[in-house]
């Protein structure tokens, strides 16, 4: 029997390489049974996760899963960092794994570094 708890399926240690100036959609896959939970996004600042209040979000519904989407239109250099989605369900707070955005500022990066290079050398993002 499948659990009817809300589950947030952001992959553990997931990472995205994106360009400043481009649009980007960050998806939080949400599984629920009856009532869709209230889901929010936050950005990690040290050990605290700062709620993103005034950001454009939307829902995309698919057959077996829904996606709560955080829109970046466009991506800005300071969007670099780690994000988490969380859901309120039956008075419980369910938190996803964090997902990390590596933003390359095309104006300052003459040659786009590789994804693996950005993961291991984050200072490249701020050259």
């Amino acid at each position: 029997k499948e659990s009817c708890d809300v589950q947030l399926y952001i992959k553990r240690q997931s990472e995205h390489s994106i360009l400043a100036g481009d649009p980007f959609e960050l998806e939080c896959p949400v599984k629920y049974c009856a009532n869709r939970p209230h889901v929010t996004w936050c950005k990690l600042n040290g050990t605290t996760c700062v709620k993103l209040e005034d950001r454009q979000t939307s829902w995309k519904e698919e057959k077996n899963i829904s996606f709560f989407i955080l829109h970046f239109e466009p991506v800005l250099p300071n969007d670099n960092g780690s994000y988490r989605c969380s859901a309120n369900f039956q008075s419980n707070l369910i938190e996803s794994h964090s997902t990390t955005l590596y933003v390359t500022d095309v104006k300052s990066a003459s040659e786009r570094p590789s994804k693996d290079e950005m993961a291991s050398r984050p200072w490249l993002l701020y050259r």
Epitope: Y9, K11, Q13, S14, E15, H16, H97, K115, A119
Partner: antibody
């Protein structure tokens, strides 16, 4: 059921490029991570790297990073490994493995492995 | 890199004896999510590794309950309470907490 199957040339010349494919069935690769692991004859296991097929993001073993490229093709549900400038030390059994998702994130399914010999 | 050191490198036991394999990591494997991604694999000759234990102590389905895992932080143990002939294999610990992922060097279990 979940299956992974490695394929590619069994013999590669020194200084050449090793190219392998991991064909996956019974699951959607974009929901998981795909890893490559190798095992030289009579030795232990060495992690090569992994890819997130959902977006192509890779992580590599620093000892191999300058020579390795892992890629994926969601439409074919497969991942690939390329290792350049090979030497005899790259002779090994190469495995691809799936990292299962929420909530365990471990290598729960492996291919049978393919033996690659580097020799002229 | 996280170094995973297993001990002993090999052990030879009689049927029914207890096997203990240790794995020590050079850094804590406790992840930010509060879980410890330490796994044990069994590899028999000519076969790929098979997952036995994940998250330190959770037994994979189909794995006999004579196998168990324990530990925390940097010190972990795989125990086989009563060794059987089919347990002859090489056992590897693996950490999935930090990049790069790393394996222990392996412990070979033989029957006396």
């Amino acid at each position: 059921q979940v299956q992974l199957q490695e394929s590619g040339p069994g013999l590669v010349k020194p200084s050449g490029t090793l190219s392998l494919t991991c064909a996956d069935s019974g699951f959607n690769i974009k929901d998981t991570y795909i890893h490559w692991v190798r095992q030289p004859p009579g030795k232990g296991l060495e992690w090569i790297g992994r890819i997130d097929p959902a977006n192509g993001f890779t992580r590599y073993n620093p000892s191999l990073k300058s020579r390795v490229t892992i890629s994926s093709d969601k439409s074919k549900n497969q991942a690939s490994l390329k290792l350049s400038s090979v030497t005899a030390a790259d002779t090994a059994v190469y495995y691809c493995a799936r990292e299962d998702g929420y909530p365990y994130y471990t290598l729960d399914a492996w291919g049978q492995g393919t033996t690659v010999t580097v020799s002229s | 890199d996280i170094v995973m050191t297993q001990s002993p490198d090999s052990l030879a036991l009689s049927l029914g004896e207890r096997a203990t394999i240790n794995c020590k990591s050079s850094q804590s494997l406790l992840d930010v999510d509060g879980k410890t991604y330490l796994n044990w694999f069994q590899q028999k000759p000519g076969q790929p590794p098979k997952r036995l234990i994940y998250l330190v102590s959770k037994l994979d389905s189909g794995v006999p309950d004579r196998f168990s895992g324990s530990g925390s932080g940097t010190d972990f143990t795989l125990t086989i309470s009563s060794v059987q002939a089919e347990d002859v294999a090489v056992y590897y610990c693996w950490q999935g907490t930090h990049f790069p992922r790393t394996f222990g060097q392996g412990t070979k279990l033989e029957i006396k």
